[in-house]
Amino acid sequence: AQHVTTQLVLRNKGVYESVKYIQQENFWIGPSSIDLIHLGAKFSPCIRKDQQIEQLVLRERDLERDSGCCVQNDHSGCIQTQRKDCSETLATFVKWQDDTGPPMDKSDLGQKRTSGAVCHQDPRTCEEPASSGAHIWPDDITKWPICTEQAKSNRTGFLHMDCQIKGRPCCISTKGSCEITTREYCEFMHGYFHEEATLCSQVHCLDKVCGLLPFLNPEVPDQFYRLWLS
């Protein structure tokens, strides 16, 4: 059986939309499937790599690599999206391409960045971990670390940094899929909202879905002990 909840929820474009949340009900009247997984149920994607889930994550990453920061022209906010999802009339899509990107590093002006921009994250304004020396962030935003400390400045002069961020990674469903969403939408969908991250590639949704002990390598499920727990 299914339990359907409908509610008006604030979405990425800053408008309220009617959203459906469909929950598979437990046949025996008990915890939901997500709760059962958290409690240690035999759920194979938590035990070993699941090809379907792996393909999903890779597909999400490929899309994210090509994303940019969609900044609303009325200064109402910004969100990481694909160009096609960013209004050409109501917003500005900040995306580095050709020769318009910043240099990879201040010491090497020859190589320009082509992957990015990312709403609220920039190698030129992140103090920790700083993009310098032997630790220059790669030209692939899906390999960027989470910035834990921004440069202490109210404004940077960069459109994608000085905007109010409207969406962050949200881990939704038992499949460990990730979407950049508003907090409201994420909570309504019973997802896990990552306040600290800017990109889906910075979070490991399956690790969150599975719970219990974190995976040794966040990319590789290793909870073999579930076979005995349940």
Epitope: R124, T125, A130, S132, K152, R155, T156, F158
Partner: antibody, heavy 123, light 106 residues
């Protein structure tokens, strides 16, 4: 208010080492993203970038002069120093220091300049 | 190294007149920077990233261009605009300036 002021010997002889100091206020060179650069201008001529130093102690020197240039900083005193070894008459110029910023820029720029100090190399 | 060639080297304009000077790069660059220098003074930043006006710069100044060809325009010349204008690139080391365009008041 951001200000920079250069100081130097005024006159020195060929083969000596030129020592310049840039004293600044209104910002700190420990602030992420900032730098200070040295630029010179022979009388009636154009501008030439010499060297710059960043908040994280990364340095750049013009390759044409690299073997003669040494740039350093004293963050606590808000000062940047430039030494040019083995000077000759071609080093006679006005020497400017300038703050380097990248506010809103994909690259960097010299946003505030000092008034300059004149250096004459003569025997 | 990237050589920046400014033209003309010298030009004069009457008050209210539109003025355009150019800066040509020996190889393609992403952005150009423009500085103004009045006699006996230090340079002052006018334009960054080709077309962005620096803080406090009058809106009569504008920059444009791409690749190897860039220009600085003064929409209506004023007496205080008489100065030497330098273009600069930060696209690759060594950092270079153009030789300057001297703008005089007619």
């Amino acid at each position: 208010q951001v200000t920079l002021k250069e100081s130097g010997p005024g006159i020195l002889q060929p083969s000596q080492t030129l020592s310049l100091t840039c004293s600044f206020s209104g910002f700190s060179l420990s602030t992420f993203g900032l730098g200070v650069g040295w630029i010179r201008q022979p009388s009636g001529k154009g501008l030439e970038c010499l060297a710059h130093i960043w908040w994280d102690d990364d340095k750049y020197s013009n390759p044409a002069l690299k073997s003669r240039l040494t740039i350093s900083k004293d963050t606590s005193k808000n000062q940047v120093f430039l030494k040019i070894a083995n000077v000759d008459s071609a080093d006679t110029a006005t020497y400017f220091c300038a703050r380097i910023l990248n506010y809103g820029s994909n690259y960097w720029y010299f946003d505030v300049w000092g008034t300059g100090t004149t250096v004459t190399v003569s025997s | 190294q990237i050589v920046l060639t400014q033209s003309p080297a010298l030009m004069s304009a009457s008050p209210g007149e539109k003025v355009t000077m150019t800066c040509s790069a020996s190889s393609s660059i992403s952005y150009m920077y423009w500085y103004q220098q009045k006699p006996g003074s230090s340079p002052r930043l006018l334009i960054y990233d080709t077309s962005n006006l620096a803080s406090g710069v009058p809106v009569r100044f504008s920059g444009s261009g791409s690749g190897t060809s860039f220009s600085l325009t003064v929409s209506r010349m004023e007496a205080e605009d008489a100065a030497t204008y330098y273009c600069q690139q930060w696209n690759s080391y060594p950092l270079t300036f153009g030789a300057g365009t001297k703008l005089e008041l007619k």
